[in-house]
């Protein structure tokens, strides 16, 4: 007769491992018990479970209610084990010694290797500003067993450099994603990849890159100078700017307060019916955590040439 | 050599407790039941009850539940068995015994402590 | 009383064969596995007979048991002065969850 067996079974983290064993001999020899022991290189071989034909499994006390015997139906050769919710602790060399009559005795060992799927934590670097040279986006950091493999899937141009550390069951893994920031980055998706013998499906982890800029400032609203003219309703000025963070508007005037009746709503400066005291040079400020920005422009208010009381005689002129 | 090594006899007056300790060597502590039994002078032997040595968990004859605790300590090798509310008829030889025979994980006590004779006596 | 029955005493001649019987039920010897203890005069228990038959290394092979049903027993050939001891059979018990003794065989060498 003789064993059959597994050189190496397989187990994620938290489940059941089956070592098997199994007595493949003739019609007539019976197995009388089969002896499992866990075999480790410093500490020797450790009684694990002992399952006897006629009185069942007796296990020891270290694997006390973790030891079984796999469901039924069972086959009284089959002297497999069901190791149940299998630890880090538990990797390493099994051993099955199988007592037949009339055979005698076989042996056999298997090795258990326990993966420790990872738990991937991203880490977003420092704020990252326009301007800035090639700097740190994130990183992304995996441990398990064995090590696991992290990539960045990103349609942003940058560099990623990996590193790992080995402790005494498992490896941690740490890739780092740099780039050299710019406003076309801001709001783009910077993704950890981690893939792993123990995952079903590659685990990932999004960060939204958030790259902290402000733009120009430029002014709307004076494309039409003949627009700005005397009793005209609905006057307005519109500073131009974007950035992240949002900027913050602030409305001025160069020589002197604002007008009255002049209201400053956000990015934009409404005017009441314009009189010419409202000509003047109006500065827009725009500014945000990283910087500040101004435009200014100059507002002629034009006479209204329908106002008969400013009208020119142009005859009498001449 | 394999061996259990007990505590010296004791002599206890009705209601008390005694503690009786039980001292392993010469095999890998953590990895054999330690079992506690007891004889009466001129009787039988009587099981007590069992302690895992490595988690420390205990199971007891009903006839001793809430009367008996059994500890351990890793560090030394050492089994207790503590009896409470002590009565004459406690007075017995109290032995601990080793599960296993020959390193292998069988039902039976293949060593023996000593024994601790414990007298109950006003 | 204990729960598994043995005589309370067998004697016989040097040389000869004795038998020690002890009976249980279906919840002890009937599903487990039946040890025998020998204990000398004055000495700690020692284990004699484990698994119905199999003897530990060092116990002479003039002691055998056998086990059928929900009974068990101990044989001693070519009987010896040194033989002379109590006897106890044991088995773990399924009702009760514990160990279970028979009440002990005191065994005299006549002669």
């Known amino acids: 007769g003789e064993l059959e067996t597994s050189d190496l079974v397989t187990v994620v983290l938290g489940q059941d491992a089956k070592l098997p064993c199994f007595y493949r001999g003739d019609p007539d020899e019976q197995v009388g018990q089969v002896a499992w022991a866990r075999v480790d290189p410093n500490e020797g071989t450790r009684e694990l479970a002992l399952l006897h034909s006629k009185y069942g499994l007796h296990v020891s006390p270290a694997y006390e209610d973790r030891v079984e015997q796999p469901p039924p139906p069972r086959d009284p050769l089959d002297g497999s084990i069901l190791l149940r919710n299998a630890v880090q602790a538990d990797e390493g060399e099994y051993e099955c010694r199988v007592s037949t009559f009339p055979a005698g005795s076989f042996q056999a060992r298997m090795r258990l290797r326990v993966l420790v799927p990872p738990l991937p934590s991203l880490n977003p670097g420092p704020p990252l500003e326009e301007g800035q040279g090639l700097t740190l986006a994130a990183s992304c950091t995996a441990e398990g067993s064995p090590a696991p493999s992290v990539t960045w899937d990103t349609e942003v141009k940058g560099t990623q450099s990996s590193r790992s550390f080995k402790h005494s069951r498992s490896a941690a893994v740490t890739s780092e994603f740099h780039l050299v920031p710019s406003r076309s980055m801001n709001g783009q998706p910077l993704t950890c990849v981690v893939s792993h013998p123990g995952l079903l499906q590659d685990q990932r982890i999004t960060h939204t890159l958030q790259v902290a800029f402000l733009a120009e400032a430029s002014v709307r609203g004076l494309e039409d100078q003949n627009l700005w003219h005397v009793g005209r309703e609905g006057a307005t000025l519109k500073c131009l700017s974007e950035g992240q963070p949002p900027p913050k508007y602030n409305w001025t005037r160069l020589d002197g307060p604002l007008p009255s009746g002049v209201r400053v709503k956000g990015d934009t400066l409404g005017f009441p019916p314009l009189t010419t005291e409202h000509s003047g040079v109006y500065v827009c400020h725009v500014s945000n955590e990283l910087s500040s920005r101004a435009s200014q422009v100059t507002v002629e208010v034009l006479a209204d040439p329908e106002d008969p009381g400013k009208q020119v005689d142009l005859v009498s002129a001449s | 050599q394999v061996q259990l090594v007990q505590s010296g006899a004791e002599v206890k007056k009705p209601g008390a407790s005694v503690k009786v300790s039980c001292k392993a060597s010469?095999?890998?502590?953590?990895?054999?039941?330690i079992h506690w039994v007891r004889q009466a002078p001129g009787q039988g032997l009587e099981w007590m009850g069992i302690?895992?040595?490595?988690?420390?968990?205990?199971s007891s004859a009903q006839k001793f539940q809430g009367r008996v605790t059994m500890t351990r300590d890793t560090s030394t090798s050492t089994v207790y068995m503590e009896l409470s509310s002590l009565r004459s008829e406690d007075t017995a030889v109290y032995y601990c015994?080793?599960?296993?025979?020959?390193?292998?994980?069988?039902?039976?006590?293949?060593?023996w402590g000593q024994g601790t004779l414990v007298t109950v006596s006003s | 009383q204990s729960v598994l029955t043995q005589p309370p005493s067998v004697s016989e001649a040097p040389r000869q064969r004795v038998t020690i019987s002890c009976s249980g039920s279906?919840?002890?010897?009937?599903?487990?596995?039946v040890n025998w203890y020998q204990q000398l005069p004055g000495k700690a228990p020692k284990l004699l007979i484990y698994?119905?038959?199999l003897l530990p290394s060092g116990v002479s092979d003039r002691f055998s048991g056998s086990k059928s049903g929900t009974s068990a027993s101990l044989a001693i050939s070519g009987l010896q002065s040194e033989d002379e001891a109590d006897y106890y059979c044991?088995?773990?018990?399924?009702?009760?969850?514990?160990?279970?003794f028979g009440g002990g065989t005191k065994l005299t060498v006549l002669g």
């Open positions: 698994y119905d038959d």
């Open positions: 010469g095999y890998t502590f953590t990895s054999y039941y």
């Open positions: 044991a088995a773990w018990d399924d009702s009760l969850n514990g160990f279970v």
């Open positions: 279906s919840s002890n010897i009937g599903n487990n596995a």
């Open positions: 015994a080793k599960e296993g025979v020959g390193g292998e994980l069988l039902r039976a006590f293949d060593i």
């Open positions: 302690i895992n040595p490595i988690s420390g968990r205990t």
